[in-house]
Structure formats: structure tokens, C-alpha cells
Interface confidence: low
């Protein structure tokens, strides 16, 4: 045969990945690998992964020859152990007006009266604990809320009789219920005044508010 | 082959400042976290922290937490344990370890550390 | 810190019997990345520990096959298959799953 059929183990280099080749024989070879590869021809990757030191439930990401941290949000650094300040990062993190306070692995939201849960974004349900008269509505409010009254009922809580229901106020005058007591509010037609708008007015004095 | 050579047995009084070594070779040195583990005598093994070669960013178990400090010469492959004000309760033998497989892989031989007055 | 327990304190086998240690830790070693990080330590007189079984059950490069790692979640053994002159020794599991990483208290290990 002729000389250019014969085998040179090195030419050309079977050595992957930046392996150098050495002739050990006639027909054999080794490759010096590069660091980070492994194999005959250096043809695999070393897992790195195994060697890892990730904390705080990091995920090894293996490279050539070293490896890498893939931290969850709230931790940083080459080996996820240095915290992360959620609260300089997210400026809104805590909605309707709550305090952020950072923390090991995470943060917390200190609310303002009325909102609760983690970020602060959910509204307490104040009727939960209000005293609202049976029969009445209760409607939730922010740190607050208000009764919903049925007809005859009246004053915050609903616990008050209505004053205007037996019609107090006469001449088409409106009829309001004062809130903390109950009683009705007549607000009198023009040409007319009294707390129950029956005395007419000398003057064109219009809107007059009387109480009883 | 990789190796962890370990400087020799130290014999100090209290109260003296001392540093021992740990030089690697046979891998590639950064990419690896060198550990301090502290036996003492007739006791188990105790790890006392780590440094990571590349950074030199360390982490210490809360119990040896400033009572040593750990330290890196990247130049010539060598991580170092030291004590400012060595103690009696300091007598043990040291043993710096390569990371690997999530645990301790490779081993130095040790380093006998006594303080005595 | 996670507490690792082995049982027994020590060991006395005859040569070419199986002996079992125990190892049993404080709290779940399944890490977030899926693994198990429970190794097992030989450690002879004079000389520094030597890895034998890392993740539970992978022996380590130069380890022979009598010695044999089984368990998950809190619960591990260290198995040798038929006992050696050269396996006396005292044998620790190490977790490192949590920080920080700590050892067991050991089992010796002696020839009845």
C-alpha cells in the first residue's frame, strides 16, 4: 500500500473539545483533555453539578469545567446565599399603603388598618364583625362599613325606628332620618316653614331645614 | 491526581495567633469550594466552613462563626485556616476537604493543631 | 442544625459477615434539586476520612463493591456485604442537604 493509506493515530487529531493529541504507538493515541471534559477523545462534558454547594433551593446549571447557581427570587449570589431586598427591588410590593420589611429569604407587608394578606391587597371584610340590625344589609367598606336599612328602620346600625314613615313632614316637604337618633329632618317647599313645613313663609325664604 | 497538601502539626500556647494551609493541585483550583473540617480528639468530624476559591466568598458554621477566619491565595493554589488569639478548646486536627459530589471528596492529610500553656 | 443519628455506637462482626449501620436524620435530606445529599465516611486511626458512598448509594471511585448504600427521606444504611481485616474503622454518615453540613457521632467497627 501506498504511504499516504497509512494510519497516522494524530492526523488528523481524534481529540475533541480542545484535547491535545499524543501518539502512544504504531496505532494508538491518548488525548490530553482540556479541563471540564473527560472521555478517550475528550468528547464529554464533566456533570460539575454534583459538586455543588447551591443553598436555599438554587439549581446547579452545569457549564465547562465550573458550574452555576440558579437562585429562586428571593436569594442571590454564586451560591444563592445572599439575600435578596425585595423591598428595594419591588417599591410596590405592599399595596394600598402597607409597609415592606425585608427578611431572610423573603419579606413581609405590615397593612394599614382595613387591608390584610401577604401583599396587602385584600380588603378585611369588616361585616364580619359588625352589629348590624337582623333584617338589615351590611356593606364593607375600608376599615369601615355601613347598614343598609329596610323600610321602617333607620341610624347607623339600623337599630332605630323610622320617623318617617308616619309621613311627619306636610306640603311635599322631604323627609330624612337623622342618623344618630332617628328622628326625621323636614327639608320645606319654598313658601313654607316649621319643623313639620306647615307654617307659611312672609318672605320667599326657600329650603328651610327644620328638626324634630 | 488531585491533592490537598496540609501544613505541618503546630504546638502553640494560648492566646498566640496562628495560620495553617492547605495547597491543591491536580484540578482546576477556582472552581472548586475548599471546606475546614475540625475533629477533635476522639470526636467525630465537625465542618467548620468554607471558601470559594474564585471569590473568595466564605461561609461559616454559626458555632465556629469569629473564632477563625478563612482565606485564599488563588496565585499559588492554597487556602488557609487562621486563629487571631488561639484557645485550649482549639486543640484538634484540622482537615481541609474539596468539595465533589455534594460532599467531601478529597482530603488533606491534617493538620494537628495543640495550644497549651 | 440537622441531627444525625447512628446506631449502633459500635460494631463486632465476624470476617466474611454482613454488617449494617444505621443512620437516621432529624428532618427530610431530599434537597430541592431532587437529590438526596447523604454520604458515608470510613475514617481509620491516624488518617483523615474517606468517602465511600456519596448520594445515598453511588460508591466512589476505588470503593469495592462490598460496600453498599440504601435508604431515602430520614433513613439510611450502610451495608458491607462480607466483612474485611482492612474495613476496621470507624464508619460516620454526613448530610449535606441543609446547611450547615453535619456528621453523625460514628460507629466503630471491630472484628468479633
Known amino acids: 500500500a501506498g504511504s499516504d493509506s497509512l494510519y497516522v493515530p494524530c492526523a488528523p487529531s481524534p481529540c475533541v473539545n480542545g484535547g491535545t493529541c499524543r501518539q502512544t504507538g504504531d496505532f494508538t493515541f491518548e488525548c490530553n483533555c482540556l479541563p471540564g471534559f473527560e472521555g478517550s477523545t475528550c468528547e464529554r462534558n464533566i456533570d460539575d453539578c454534583p459538586n455543588h454547594r447551591c443553598q436555599n433551593g438554587g439549581v446547579c446549571v452545569d457549564g465547562v469545567n465550573t458550574y452555576n447557581c440558579r437562585c429562586p427570587p428571593q436569594w442571590t449570589g454564586q451560591f444563592c446565599t445572599e439575600d435578596v431586598d425585595e423591598c428595594l427591588l419591588q417599591p410596590n410590593a405592599c399595596q394600598n399603603g402597607g409597609t415592606c420589611a425585608n427578611r431572610n429569604g423573603g419579606y413581609g407587608c405590615v397593612c394599614v388598618n382595613g387591608w390584610s394578606g401577604d401583599d396587602c391587597s385584600e380588603n378585611i371584610d369588616d361585616c364580619a364583625f359588625a352589629s348590624c340590625t337582623p333584617g338589615s344589609t351590611c356593606i364593607d367598606r375600608v376599615a369601615s362599613f355601613s347598614c343598609m336599612c329596610p323600610e321602617g328602620k333607620a341610624g347607623l346600625l339600623c337599630h332605630l325606628d323610622d320617623a318617617c314613615i308616619s309621613n311627619p313632614c306636610h306640603k311635599g316637604a322631604l323627609c330624612d332620618t337623622n342618623p344618630l337618633n332617628g328622628q326625621y329632618i323636614c327639608t320645606c317647599p319654598q313658601g313654607y316653614k316649621g319643623a313639620d313645613c306647615t307654617e307659611d313663609v312672609d318672605e320667599g325664604n326657600s329650603h328651610h331645614h327644620h328638626h324634630h | 491526581e488531585v491533592q490537598l497538601v496540609q501544613s505541618g502539626a503546630e504546638v502553640k500556647k494560648p492566646g498566640e495567633s496562628l495560620k495553617i494551609s492547605c495547597k491543591g493541585s491536580?484540578?482546576?483550583?477556582?472552581?472548586?469550594?475548599i471546606h475546614w473540617v475540625r475533629q477533635m480528639p476522639g470526636k467525630g468530624p465537625e465542618w467548620t466552613g468554607y471558601i470559594i476559591p474564585g471569590s473568595g466568598g466564605t461561609k461559616f458554621n454559626e458555632k465556629f462563626k469569629g473564632q477563625a477566619t478563612i482565606s485564599v491565595d488563588k496565585s499559588i493554589t492554597t487556602a488557609y485556616l487562621q486563629w487571631s488569639s488561639l484557645k485550649a478548646s482549639d486543640t484538634a486536627m484540622y482537615y481541609c476537604a474539596r468539595d465533589g459530589a455534594g460532599s467531601f471528596t478529597y482530603w488533606g492529610q491534617g493538620t494537628l493543631v495543640t495550644v497549651s500553656s | 442544625d440537622i441531627v444525625m443519628t447512628q446506631s449502633p455506637d459500635s460494631l463486632a462482626v465476624s470476617l466474611g459477615e454482613r454488617a449494617t449501620i444505621n443512620c437516621r436524620s432529624s428532618q427530610s435530606l431530599v434537597h430541592s434539586d431532587g437529590n438526596t445529599y447523604l454520604h458515608w465516611y470510613q475514617q481509620k486511626p491516624g488518617q483523615p476520612p474517606k468517602l465511600l458512598i456519596y448520594r445515598i448509594s453511588n460508591r466512589f471511585s476505588g470503593v469495592p463493591d462490598r460496600f453498599s448504600g440504601s435508604g431515602s427521606g430520614t433513613d439510611f444504611t450502610l451495608t458491607i456485604s462480607s466483612l474485611q481485616a482492612e474495613d476496621v474503622a470507624v464508619y460516620y454518615c454526613?448530610?449535606?442537604?441543609?446547611?450547615?453540613?453535619?456528621f453523625g457521632g460514628g460507629t466503630k467497627v471491630e472484628i468479633k
Open positions: 454526613l448530610q449535606s442537604t441543609h446547611f450547615p453540613d453535619t
Open positions: 491536580g484540578y482546576t483550583f477556582s472552581n472548586y469550594v
